[in-house]
């Protein structure tokens, strides 16, 4: 509440994240031009990434384009791509929707249709949809332990949200434990009225606000956080602003003296953990 | 303005960005003695990071050292590194500006030069000047989508740049399209008074700054971003205190049982997303 | 100090680390069967990651998992996880401690154990204790260049921590030159009252707060910053709530067709930069 | 000049083997996809095989499960293995490359072509 006679000082805040689950991936796997079912288990090391304090990201869903190299391949026949001859391939040209520079020539991309030949990573990523439903789906049973240390320097006051007193085997409920800092992540987004099983298939960005409202004076002395979840990213987002959530990342290797590299596209959620708050005191 | 009756309340932000182009990179290769023009493609995945939240790094330059290996190998001749006799070579000593640890030994680096023989990351990197012009200075053309959610908890307020209306093809212009939030990078230079050729033969860090100054009073509601642009780094810094922006990293390998890496001292430019302001409220 | 007629305004900030040092590890190593004592070099791209703004992370220790490759392999024999019949394993069941997930067999993990057979990266992480002392225990010595950027954009002013006077081969201390950016992370640690060789091999958080305190008022004006260290993690934290500061990353690699990955679980230091303050004009 | 130069062929039983090989040379950029045609007395030029610079391989139905191509970029060059010959495999082969002659310069470069004959 808000004391008009006390010096309010807003906070300073450092956050630790901790990630726990396994997933079970099962995906068709082609080789050799044959198709099989693949069966793949992904841990921490395998779906979240080394991030800096205020933001962890969770993988649930992936594009792989394996076995690139650079050279030249008949670009993706996206909408609008196609060609019939030469004079529609411009060379040096790069459209922004494709992933390489024209080289000038209209070339086969299968037996039906020719598009623009490119110098790029080939073949080039097609453009297809995040699988349905989300390969890492069971993500939603991941939990997630927050770390919180605050300060209010004016105040000389630290604290943080974990207490000597708490129990490392706790999961946060709203009603029953709203002190716990390991969250479900599944129960993450069902406070945000959110619907995880969905989000997971293209990515999305979910905010934890860790709100503290300190009351310093020691005669009525209260300093713990409150919880709250909402999502950041818009989900009525149109195509062109890229809805979801997703990135590309790139592993390199070389293999008959050429360098190659798998290409993920990504799609996960990203977590933003927002602190915020005061501490007043006399 | 300024409306002192109001209740002010600093902005709870979230931003997502996204990255898009690509570069052509034309560059002198060196393989088995002989030297050829080497050509590659780079998109997304190969010159940007996954970064979480506030920052975004586009590299626009690089330096390579391929094929280090763990062992021994006389340091890098620069100004003051030489010696003549193994006097001058300390064992166990680490030169804040060498790349390993000295053995005592006074070692040929090429006809002419005798440095310290060191243990380290072999042959060392050698100390030569960032590419000049950038080898990814094409990066001008890329754009970059901004996407920000903000907050405003105690006015229990949440809106976002991107709305409905927009149109996902614009690009940013001060006077033009003032509320477009896909920018190009050559764009936030010129409005910087920055020159984008220059900065990114050495890296920089530009930030982006996004003010809101919102008054959520319902009979005279406004709560849209202004955008402006300013250098962020020191562009006249002295030598020792490491201008530009650069950060080196390493790709591993194997080859013949010996591990190997390929390190890339990568330069570019690291942007800066700065969400201020306040709402108000009577 | 506080002058209530001014018009306060918080501190907008950008940061920019550098760190320096080399690391010279001895552990052993078996290959073949035969244990011998390794001896490597760790520069920058080796131990610390490249990372955005307010944090940076440097690598003091860490255990290594090779050659792991997705298989069925009997699950690491922690306390309560051996069984003596399949009636103990569950098939499909994952343990939140375990890495894999069970296929409901009991099977010999050695000579004297059995535990749950599981689906996993195998062979499964050992959970062994991190190396004692740390394996980059020298990381003391480390210097960490720190590059701060401020702004008040209501009084239109600017200004960074580093003045064109200062000598890029200073060490900060706190009484004799408290201006210098330039700081050694054992003094660091030291400044506040920790111990670096005993948190390197845990890992753990360390902030670095930088308070500007501006008065701009033309005839009175000071606005320079002041730096302190506090360590953010709780040293006295709960085995069941993390302590310390690791995370696990993994370098992907094929091997006779088959991709397997080698597992590094990294402890370290990271360090938040926190900067706060205020701008004060008439 | 830019050359393909086709070496392996000649007369074979059928069940018998041959490998074909096609190297590159003069002065270019890089060396893309690189395929084997055939042609038949009296028919029209059809792919055996073709593989990309990253080794990815496409074959003829014919061809499927007998023939392998294979390359070395080292050398700039294609090989086919021919495994399995049969009678209906007599033809001219002929290497196909398409080469970058500099940066986004690409020509369909033909080798002479090599004969292959294989008796019952």
């Known amino acids: 509440s808000d004391k008009l006679y006390q010096r309010k000082e807003p906070v300073i805040s450092s956050v630790h994240t901790k990630v726990k689950g396994i997933a079970e991936v099962t995906e068709n796997v082609t080789e050799g031009g044959v198709t099989k079912l693949g069966h793949s288990i992904f841990d921490t090391a395998d779906y979240t990434f080394p991030l800096q304090g205020n933001s962890f990201f969770v993988m649930t869903n992936y594009v792989k384009s394996e076995g690139q190299v650079q050279t030249l391949c008949p670009e993706y026949p996206r909408r609008g791509a196609q060609c019939s001859s030469d004079r529609r391939c411009k060379k040096g040209w790069m459209d922004p929707q494709s992933k390489g520079i024209q080289t000038g020539r209209c070339v086969p991309y299968d037996k039906t249709r020719k598009t623009c030949e490119v110098s790029a990573w080939c073949p080039t990523e097609e453009e297809k949809e995040a699988p349905r439903p989300a390969l890492l789906r069971s993500a939603e049973n991941f939990t997630v332990l927050i770390k919180n240390n605050i300060h209010f320097p004016g105040h000389n006051y630290t604290t943080r949200n974990i207490l000597p007193t708490m129990n490392g085997s706790c999961t946060f409920h709203k009603t029953w434990d709203p002190q716990c800092s390991i969250f479900r992540l599944g129960d993450i987004f069902q406070e945000a009225g959110e619907n995880f099983t969905e989000v997971a298939v293209q990515g999305g960005i979910m905010g934890i606000e860790i709100y503290w409202d300190c009351n310093l004076d020691s005669w009525s002395h209260h300093c713990r956080p409150r919880y709250s979840f909402r999502r950041l990213d818009d989900k009525n987002m149109d195509e062109s602003f890229v809805p979801g959530y997703n990135f590309r990342y790139a592993k390199y290797y070389k293999e008959n003296n050429v360098e190659k590299r798998t290409l993920i596209k990504a799609f996960g959620i990203r977590f933003d953990i927002l602190v915020f708050g005061t501490g007043g005191k006399f | 303005s300024d409306k002192l009756y109001q209740r002010k309340e600093p902005v709870i932000s979230s931003v997502h960005t996204k990255v898009k182009g690509i570069a052509e990179v034309t560059e002198n290769v060196t393989e088995g003695g002989v030297t050829k023009l080497g050509h590659s493609i780079f998109d997304t995945a190969d010159y940007t990071f996954p970064l979480q939240g506030n920052s975004f790094f586009v590299m626009t330059n690089y330096v390579k050292s391929e094929g280090q290996v763990q062992t021994l190998c006389p340091e890098y001749p620069r100004r003051g590194a030489q010696c003549s006799s193994d006097r001058r070579c300390k064992k166990g000593w680490m030169d804040p500006q060498s790349k390993g640890i000295q053995t005592g030994r006074c070692v040929p680096y090429d006809k002419t030069r005798k440095t310290c023989e060191v243990s380290a990351w072999c042959p060392t990197e050698e100390e030569k000047e960032a590419p000049r012009p950038a080898l990814l200075r094409s990066a001008e053309n890329f754009t970059v989508l901004i996407k920000n959610n903000i907050h405003f908890p105690g006015h229990n307020y949440t809106t976002r740049n991107i709305l409905p209306t927009m149109n996902g093809s614009c690009t940013f212009h001060k006077t033009w399209d003032p509320q477009c939030s896909i920018f190009r990078l050559g764009d936030i230079f010129q409005e910087a008074g920055e020159n984008f050729t220059e900065v990114a033969v050495q890296g920089g860090i530009m930030g982006i700054e996004i003010y809101w100054d919102c008054n959520l009073d319902s009979w005279s509601h406004h709560c849209r971003p202004r955008y402006s642009f300013r250098r962020l780094d020191d562009k006249n810094m002295d030598e020792s205190f490491v201008p530009g922006y650069n950060f080196r990293y390493a790709k591993y390998y194997k080859e013949n049982n010996v591990e190997k890496r390929t390190l890339i001292k990568a330069f570019g430019i690291r942007f800066d997303i700065l969400v201020f302001g306040t709402g108000g409220k009577f | 100090s506080d002058k209530l007629y001014q018009r306060k305004e918080p501190v907008i900030s950008s940061v920019h680390t550098k760190v320096k040092g080399i690391a010279e590890v001895t552990e052993n190593v078996t290959e073949g069967g035969v244990t011998k004592l390794g001896h490597s070099i760790f520069d920058t791209a080796d131990y610390t990651f490249p990372l955005q703004g307010n944090s940076f992370f440097v690598m003091t220790n860490y255990v290594k998992s090779e050659g792991q490759v997705q298989t069925l392999c009997p699950e690491y024999p922690r306390r309560g996880a051996q069984c003596s019949s399949d009636r103990r394993c569950k098939k499909g069941w994952m343990d939140p401690q375990s890495k894999g997930i069970q296929t409901g067999r009991c099977v010999p993990y050695d000579k004297t154990r059995k535990t749950c057979e599981v689906s996993a990266w195998c062979p499964t992480e050992e959970e062994k204790e991190a190396p004692r002392p740390a394996l980059l225990r020298s990381a003391e010595n480390f210097t960490v260049l720190i590059k701060n950027n401020i702004h008040f954009p209501g009084h239109n002013y600017t200004t960074r921590n580093i003045l064109p006077t200062m000598n890029g081969s200073c060490t900060f201390h706190k009484t004799w030159d408290p201006q210098c950016s330039i700081f050694r992370l054992g003094d660091i640690f030291q400044e506040a009252g920790e111990n670096f060789t005993e948190v390197a091999v845990q890992g753990g958080i360390m902030g670095i707060e930088i308070y500007w305190d501006c008065n701009l008022d033309s005839w009175s004006h000071h606005c320079r910053p002041r730096y302190s260290f506090r360590r953010l993690d709780d040293k006295n934290m709960d085995e069941s709530f993390v302590p310390g500061y690791n995370f696990r990353y993994a370098k992907y690699y094929k091997e006779n067709n088959v991709e397997k990955r080698t597992l590094i679980k990294a402890f370290g230091i990271r360090f938040d930069i926190l900067v706060f303050g205020t701008g004060g004009k008439f | 000049a830019v050359q393909l130069v086709e070496s392996g062929g000649g007369l074979v039983q059928a069940g018998g083997s041959l490998r074909l090989s096609c190297a590159a040379s003069?002065?270019?950029?890089?060396?893309?996809?690189m395929a084997w045609y055939r042609q038949a007395p009296g028919k029209q030029r059809e792919l055996v095989a073709d593989i990309t610079r990253g080794d990815r391989t496409n074959y003829a139905d014919t061809v499927n499960g007998r023939f392998t191509i294979s390359r070395d970029n080292v050398r700039n060059t294609v090989y086919l293995q021919m495994n399995g010959l049969r009678p209906e495999d007599t033809a001219a082969y002929y290497c196909?490359?398409?080469?970058?002659?500099?940066?986004?310069?690409?020509?369909?470069?033909w080798g002479q072509g090599t004969q292959v004959t294989v008796s019952s």
């Open positions: 196909y490359a398409v080469i970058e002659l500099g940066v986004l310069e690409p020509r369909d470069y």
């Open positions: 003069g002065n270019f950029f890089r060396v893309n996809t």
